[in-house]
């Protein structure tokens, strides 16, 4: 019996087609992805093949103005329109709190939403009961397939799930649910979830009875043969893991941002064992037409977004200096504003010993593309912020050793004076440079704000200590020459859309007046 698994993950609000780098579509003839194009390909496959499941491995939420405005209603609407069969909860599904998950998505989705390792307690338990499930048995033709969900247990540090959801260890939580499926005579089981490729492989290895793992969170691109675009494969598709009980378990992921549709064909024997698995992600490029009906619906929903862009988010009573003359040479108040917003967006009081789990922010000055003039009645709009942060990036959470941070700050000024983008703006950091010294030895003082303290204060950076830092995904990926971050980071979790982080902060503060205050000397 043959099953076709179509899968997406980490779509992050890319409902419309995007450029090849998943930013805003500029030249339509070269654009990719989007739900209208995805629908065309899915329908093509559904028409051609008998047993097809369309699955999503989480993080539909967060990433563009679509999520900012529609807050998840767009996810439910268009996933329903595409007729998804199941979805696993990702960490970003909790970005607007549990209510922001329940109302727009859990109550509106026609498909089951899954996670076996999230347990509700207290008053939330009855409120959320039945709205998400540990597993679901799906009929496919004359057979049944069990889908069991999982979500990153780091979610409390990455999003806002509140205090009434417990995120258990994935493997510990999955095993009894898979065992239950086996007792229900379900012998074909897919683990669908959002914990990253390393955990996906562990699940394949450790959870007895799981036949296939469909993952997300790490934006992993797997491919067999010559890859069709710029993404470099982390391994073959599917990635085969030998389980502890000797089975070959295919593990898949489909990069991110709706650029690819994962396509996996699995052949099962009559006892539900995987006989063979093959496939590849399908690049959703312009050779695949956008479905006119879904496209028309997208255009209808778009109208509200255009109106939102020009509405006032808040006010500034000072000039927000985002000029390259400032931000690539010295501390600039736009950099301070953005870093303050980045830290504010990551306030998570999950431990009494820590005032917060992260206190530091770094931001390449070259990523700040425009100032905002306060003389327009102080008004700040989404449109204004889109000029400051036009690249559609995210502000991510990484873990780095102090020694890596020291290298990053040396790189920040290694060719100071040439108006290059690598000059770092900061938050929760005091750095002193001596530019008379030779490149690679210019950082003379580097103090960082403590986290394990009740009164935050600055202490000297310790080379061997591991620190959490918020930074743009561009830097996490080694952009602007920050190869040391990419090579040496110990953990990387993708965060919220850059403009959304700053706009939320401005809306919260109502009136802002960021200063240049001696963070960089």
């Amino acid at each position: 019996w043959e099953l076709t698994i179509l899968h997406t993950n980490d779509v992050h609000s890319r409902l419309e087609q995007t450029s090849e780098d998943s930013s805003k579509c500029v030249n339509a003839s070269r654009c990719m992805g989007g739900v209208a194009r995805l629908f065309t390909k899915v329908q093509q496959i559904r028409r051609a093949e008998p047993n097809v499941l369309l699955l999503d491995a989480g993080d539909q939420y967060q990433g563009t103005i679509w999520f900012t405005v529609y807050k998840g209603a767009e996810v439910a609407h268009f996933m329903n329109a595409l007729r998804y069969d199941a979805m696993a909860l990702g960490n970003h599904e909790f970005d607007n709190g549990v209510e922001g998950l329940i109302e727009p998505l859990l109550k509106e989705a026609k498909f089951p939403i899954l996670s076996a390792n999230i347990k509700a307690k207290g008053p939330l338990a009855s409120q959320i009961s039945g709205l998400y499930l540990p597993y679901k048995v799906l009929p496919v033709g004359d057979e049944v397939v069990g889908i069991v969900g999982y979500t990153s247990k780091e979610t409390p540090f990455l999003s806002n799930p509140g205090t009434n959801l417990v995120f258990e260890d994935e493997i510990t939580a999955l095993q009894p649910e898979v065992d239950k499926l086996k007792t229900l005579n379900v012998n074909k089981i897919i683990a669908l979830g959002h914990s990253g490729f390393e955990m996906d492989k562990l699940i394949a290895q450790k959870v007895r009875g799981v036949d296939v793992v469909v993952g997300g969170h790490s934006n992993t691109f797997l491919y067999t043969g010559n890859p069709p675009s710029k993404e470099v494969p982390a391994g073959k598709y599917p990635f085969i893991v030998t389980s502890d009980d000797g089975r070959k378990v295919p593990v898949v992921q489909a990069y991110a941002f709706g650029k690819y549709l994962g396509y996996l064909k699995i052949e099962f024997d009559e006892r539900g064992n995987v006989i063979s698995s093959h496939g590849n992600p399908i690049l959703l490029n312009s050779s695949i037409p956008e479905d006119p009906s879904i496209k028309a619906d997208i255009n209808k929903w778009r109208i509200k977004l255009d109106n939102y862009s020009t509405q006032e988010l808040g006010k500034t009573i000072v000039y927000l200096d985002g000029s390259s003359q400032s931000c690539r040479f010295r501390e600039c108040n736009m950099g301070n504003l953005i870093c303050d917003a980045m830290i504010n967006n990551n306030l998570r009081h999950t431990d009494e010993m820590f005032w917060n789990h992260v206190s530091m922010c770094i931001l390449n000055g070259g990523g700040i593309r425009s100032p905002i003039d306060e003389r327009n009645n102080g008004t700040i709009t989404w449109e204004n912020l889109a000029a400051v942060l036009p690249f559609g990036g995210t502000f991510d959470l990484v873990q780095l050793k102090g020694s890596t941070l020291k290298k990053a700050f040396e790189h920040s000024v290694h060719r100071y004076g040439q108006s290059t983008g690598e000059f770092l703006q900061v938050g929760g950091i005091h750095v002193v440079y001596d530019l008379s010294r030779k490149p690679g030895d210019r950082v003379v003082k580097l103090d960082v704000l403590c986290t394990k303290c009740r009164v935050p204060s600055y202490d000297p950076l310790k080379m061997d200590e591991v620190y959490k830092v918020i930074l743009p995904n561009f830097l996490a990926n080694g952009g602007d020459g920050f190869q040391m971050i990419k090579d040496e980071l110990l953990r990387h979790d993708s965060g919220d859309q850059d403009i959304n982080v700053v706009s939320t902060y401005i809306s919260k503060m109502k009136v802002i007046y960021p200063a240049v205050e001696g963070r960089i000397k």
Epitope: F39, A81, D85, K110, P139, G141, E143, S293, A296
Partner: antibody, heavy 121, light 107 residues
Framework: QVQLVESGGGVVQPGRSLRLSCAAS????????MHWVRQAPGKGLEWVAV????????YYPDSVKGRFTISRDNSKNTLYLQMNSLRAEDTAVYYC??????????????WGQGTMVTVSS | DIQMTQSPSSLSASVGDRVTITCRAS??????LAWYQQKPEKAPKSLIY???SLQSGVPSRFSGSGSGTDFTLTISSLQPEDFATYYC?????????FGGGTKVEIK
């Protein structure tokens, strides 16, 4: 082979009740949504009810809502339509039809031969 | 509710003719449209689903097209056994609704 056979039709007085059955064979009945569709003499097709594969949801058009109830017994591979408060306009051939395997609306790939229901005093 | 309007309600054609029947939805239904054939005193038979997919066993002279609100069923070369009534049906949302039917008669 895949087959649907309806039974239970007949002549009934207005206001009375009737229960139709549909016996399924040749496929995994419990995996499919099942529908009733009717056709009044000389008229077109009208959808009457659906029950999802796991009985989790049932849907009806306004014309029969509150009067008709669809149910199924997966252990017996049988679909039912309980029709109460019957009216003259319910006179039709009632077909049972197989839908899809999910919770989304679907088309009908397999149809029964139909059973005639006549509501008349 | 979504209204389905079929046209024409009847047509006369000869064997070998190309026949086109149209179906219009009162609102967008994407490609969630099916076509059925019904002969007198018989149950309907599924021809096409998802607007353009041929049900297995249906001759390739039948084809469907369209998306959104406007759909077409085409019989490329009418055969004697094709004289029947044809219905479209939307399955975008409940309640499921049918077109009024198109009767294809012998000229």
């Amino acid at each position: 082979q895949v087959q649907l056979v309806e039974s239970g039709g007949g002549v009934v007085q207005p206001g009375r009740s009737l229960r139709l059955s549909c016996a399924a064979s040749g496929f995994t009945f419990s995996n499919y949504g099942m529908h009733w569709v009717r056709q009044a003499p000389g008229k077109g097709l009208e959808w009457v009810a659906v029950i999802l594969y796991d009985s989790s949801n049932k849907y009806y058009p306004d014309s029969v809502k509150g009067r008709f109830t669809i149910s199924r017994d997966n252990s017996k591979n049988t679909l039912y339509l309980q029709m109460n408060s019957l009216r003259a306009e319910d006179t039709a051939v009632y077909y049972c039809a197989r839908g899809g395997s999910s919770w989304y609306p679907d088309s009908f790939d397999i149809w029964g031969q139909g059973t005639m229901v006549t509501v008349s005093s | 509710d979504i209204q389905m309007t079929q046209s024409p309600s009847s047509l006369s054609a000869s064997v070998g003719d190309r026949v086109t029947i149209t179906c219009r939805a009162s609102q967008g239904i994407s490609s969630w449209l099916a076509w059925y054939q019904q002969k007198p005193e018989k149950a309907p038979k599924s021809l096409i689903y998802a607007a353009s997919s041929l049900q297995s066993g249906v001759p390739s002279r039948f084809s469907g097209s369209g998306s959104g609100t406007d759909f077409t069923l085409t019989i490329s070369s009418l055969q004697p056994e094709d004289f029947a009534t044809y219905y479209c049906q939307q399955y975008n949302s409940y309640p499921l609704t049918f077109g009024g039917g198109t009767k294809v008669e012998i000229k």
